[in-house]
Amino acid sequence: EEDGFCQPYRGIACARFIGNRTVYMESLHMQGEIENQITAAFTMIGTSSHLSDKCSQFAIPSLCHYAFPYCDETSSVPKPRDLCRDECEILENVLCQTEYIFARSNPMILMRLKLPNCEDLPQPESPEAANCIRIGIPMAD
């Protein structure tokens, strides 16, 4: 096992968004480990009444792309592509504001679900953001 690498997505939980495209994984076993975590998280989300339709439409693919980021094909070394910061901020502050507040105060959810911090992501106009993963949130277009 060495540094991170790229491999086809082989899971089920995020297959409708990722298909069998190449994703960045930190290690050989990570894809299975993350798949188990996100499956458990989605099961929990599915039984929750706290998730609105307007939020889930974009939050679910966003969480999938955060868990299983596409490989950056422009990089000479295996590297994950970031989510787009503008979409991340709209998701957190507008579409899913209530849901994020609830999730961040619920340790059971946080144990299974990883929520991206928009401040981690490169600024929209920066070179690093040029290849970000765009979910397709209309307000960010």
């Epitope: 188990n36 970031d82 961040r104 990883k114 401040e119 981690d120």
Partner: nanobody, 111 residues
Amino acid sequence: EVQLVESGGGLVQPGGSLRLSCAASGSISRFYAVGWYRQAPGKQRELVARISSGGSTYYADSVKGRFTISIDNSKNTLYLQMNSLRAEDTAVYYCNARNLWGQGTLVTVSS
């Protein structure tokens, strides 16, 4: 804005110990994996140790049995306990999470 800040480096004699810390701004549990890399003068950066959110760990062969990686989610901090240090462990040590990197902390092992 710096998201990961390392500390704990310094000068230590061979056989000695150090504990490196990496403080994350915001929740460190937002990452699926976090790790430590190092870069010695004139050498490529190499992975030292990694810990996943599921608790599994990885260590480079050169540090196995001597280094221990751990995480404290309540303090949003990643640690690297380094024992039985050798001259070849001299390097700048970097904390990493996905595409985020700290500024590094220098570890010098010398008598």
